[in-house]
Every structure is written in C-alpha cells, then in structure tokens.
Interface confidence: low
C-alpha cells in the first residue's frame, strides 16, 4: 500500500546502514516532477542537512549539505538512471567515507561525508512521487 | 476534506472564467515547496500548457507556456505574498488580454496570453501543497 | 470532513499513567496518518507521536520507551498509551489527522481541541 508523502521517520545512521525506498514519479519527465531525500539533524523539518538529494526526473541531480541553516556546495551530476513512468528502487548506503547511492541495482551517485552520518536523527522523502517502501537497515555488528 | 494532488479537472475557460484554489504548503519556506498550476490544452499530462504557473514558496514565482513541446520565454517575479505555513487561496482570473492572479484577494501577478484560453481543456494542481478547494466558475451570459 | 475529539486527560500523580482516546468522524479516517502534539502554557506546540495509515509509528526523544500510540481503523480511533508520567507531561495533548506523516503540526490539517494532562510531583 502507499505511504504517505512527505513521509518522515526517526532514524540513527552509521556505518554500514542502507537507507531503501521505492517509488515512482507522479507526472511524466516532460513535466520535471522531483524526488527530494533529505537526512536531517533533528526531528524538526528546518533543522540542518547532512544529505540533500534531490532528482529532477529526467533532467538531472543535485546533492548538497545545509549547515547552520545555509547551504553549501552543490554538487550536480547529468546521470539519469530514472524511467519515465517506471518504479524505481533507490538504495542510499553509508559507506565510511561517503554516501553510496544505487538505483535499480546500479551504483549512480556518490557524495562524500561533510558532517559525521551520526549526526542524522530523521529521514524524510517527498516532493512528486508516490512511495510504497521505507526502510532503514543496520549492519549486523 | 482534502482533493488528492496531482489534482487535474477537466475545464473550459473563456473572458470572464475564474480558477480557484486553496491549499497549503507541505513544508516550511526554507525548504521550498513548490505549487504548481498548468492550463493544459488535452486531458494529457504531455500536452502543451496555456499558462504554467509555479511558486517557489518564499523564493520566486516562474510563468511559462509550452507550446509544441517546448518551453517558450519565462517570466519571473520576486513577488511573494504567500505566507510560510499559511493557507493561501489564489484565484487566476481569464481577463480579455491577460490572467489576473489574486493571492488571498491581493492582484499579484498577471500573465498576457499567448494562446487564447479557449484552448484550454484541463488545469492541474500539483507539487508540494495539501488542496482543499478546487473550483472553476464561468462568467454568467 | 474529519472531525476529531480527543478524551482521557485528567489529573495524576507523577508515575501514574493515562490512556488517551481520539475518536474520529469521517468514512476516510483509515486513508490519514495520525498525530499526537501537546503544548504546554507559554510554550511552542510539540510533537508527542504518529502512526502512519499501516500502523508505523514514531515518537519524540522525550516520550520513547513511555508512550504507545495505536490505532483502531474499525473503530475510527487512536489512543495514546501514558505510562511512567512525569510533571514536563503536563500539558494540552491534541489528535491531529493528515494526509502526510509527519513531525510538523502544518503537515496535519484536522485538529481536535485537545485534552488536559496534568502530572503532579
């Protein structure tokens, strides 16, 4: 069944956690719908971002941190392994130096740690899509 | 009660025809919602658009049309009279030679046509807001 | 439109527990995620717990571990489970529904009028 959307839960992050969601775009990539992840450092929707990653489907990514309120280097990558009007899984896993982000089973994206992923209190997902999977998994110590 | 979003209705517009909507933004202005209203000229979300209109909540407002596929010259505004977690109610009013924008009663915006509305046949509301009223009403003869 | 009223706040001793009980109107309450935020006299509205359309939840920091949160969509209830109450408890508890899940009192767009908690040492 679908989630809600925005769709926010309380999450710990570290080392070998997998963040997984599946979803699929509201409108066709003609129309630039967006898919906006967004870790956040507290359970409130203003607190800073440890990692912004935001699609505009069919036209681009863009990855970026907010610290003390104010964003900071954008970093942007053409890559679209997105299908107009088909599901996607998306895979976000904290690696020790980066985030490793998979899409459909293929590694796409990188972003390297600017903030410890500790720090991370609170994932949400929104913007243009539909959701039908949320899941945080923790590397078995 | 609440309209899903995407919402889309079909709709003939003319000199005299009101659109109307209510909603609210689903996120705080700092992190930039976005409410999107296109007058579409087929019940096809590819069509071409009479009048794209797309706030950026607390940041800029684009207009737009699209026409063969592609879109045309973009006009912007810095004006924003919507309120960060308020409820707005805007209105696009079909005037002989332009849509008229209210925002909470307040002309915010216009638009010269460069399709005639009679070519519009669907309005979709979509983006970063929760509906609460969608309503077209047509000038009396 | 969905109409919420909220039951079940009272007095009690510091320790003790309550039950509290939203009952919702409306053919749709099983398609809105629910909410429970308390606000205290003076102080900003706070967010206590949600549980999602499928009965996923989540809880603020401060009540982890003390509070349950559930739903009943036969019923068209949410109750909120109180235990081991503490006097920073007491305050106005209010049910909100919405068609996001979320922390944010914005994100919910039907409110009851709350009910009183009050905890004392």
């Known amino acids: 069944s679908l989630l809600p959307v925005p769709y926010t839960e309380a999450a710990s992050l570290s080392t070998g956690s997998t963040v997984t969601i599946k979803g699929r775009p509201l409108a066709c990539f003609l129309n630039e719908p967006y898919l906006q992840v967004d870790f956040h450092t507290e359970m409130k929707e203003e607190s800073d971002i440890v990692f912004h990653f935001q699609v505009c489907f069919g036209r681009r990514v863009v990855m970026n941190s907010r610290e003390y309120g104010a964003w900071k280097q954008q970093v942007e990558s053409k890559n679209m392994p997105f299908q107009d009007g088909q599901e996607f899984e998306l895979s976000i896993s904290v690696l020790p130096d980066k985030y490793q982000v998979m899409v459909n089973g293929q590694s796409s994206y990188t972003f390297d740690h600017r903030i410890k992923p500790e720090a991370v209190k609170m994932v949400q997902v929104w913007r243009d899509i539909s959701l039908t999977k949320f899941n945080v998994s923790y590397l078995k110590r | 009660s609440l309209l899903p979003v995407p919402y889309t209705e079909a709709a003939s517009l003319s000199t005299g025809s009101t659109v109307t909507i209510k909603g609210r933004p689903l996120a705080c202005f700092l992190n930039e919602p976005y409410l999107q209203v296109d007058f579409h000229t087929e019940m096809k979300e590819e069509s071409d658009i009479v009048f794209h209109f797309q706030v950026c909540f607390g940041r800029r407002v684009v207009m737009n049309s699209r026409e063969y596929g592609a879109w045309k010259q973009q006009v912007e505004s810095k004006n924003m009279p919507f309120q960060d977690g308020q409820e707005f109610e805007l209105s696009i009013s079909v005037l002989p030679d332009k849509y008229q924008v209210m925002v909470n009663g307040q002309s915010s915006y216009t638009f010269d046509h460069r399709i005639k509305p009679e070519a519009v046949k669907m309005v979709q509301v979509w983006r970063d807001i929760s509906l609460t009223k969608f309503n077209v009403s047509y000038l009396k003869r | 439109e969905l109409q919420v009223v909220e039951s079940g706040g009272g007095l009690v001793q510091a320790g003790g527990s309550l039950r509290l009980s939203c009952a919702a109107s409306g053919r749709t309450f099983s398609t809105y995620s629910m909410a429970w935020f308390r606000q205290a006299p003076g102080k900003e509205r706070e967010f206590v717990a949600a549980i999602t359309r499928s009965g996923g939840n989540t809880y603020a920091d401060s009540v982890k571990g003390r509070f349950t949160i559930s739903r009943d969509n036969a019923k068209n209830t949410v109750t909120l489970q109180m235990n081991s109450l503490k006097p920073e408890d007491t305050a106005a508890y209010h049910c909100?529904?919405?068609?996001?899940?979320?922390?944010?009192?914005?994100?919910?767009?039907?409110w009851g009028q709350g009910t009183q908690v009050t905890v004392s040492s």
């Open positions: 909100a529904a919405g068609g996001t899940y979320s922390f944010v009192p914005r994100s919910y767009n039907y």
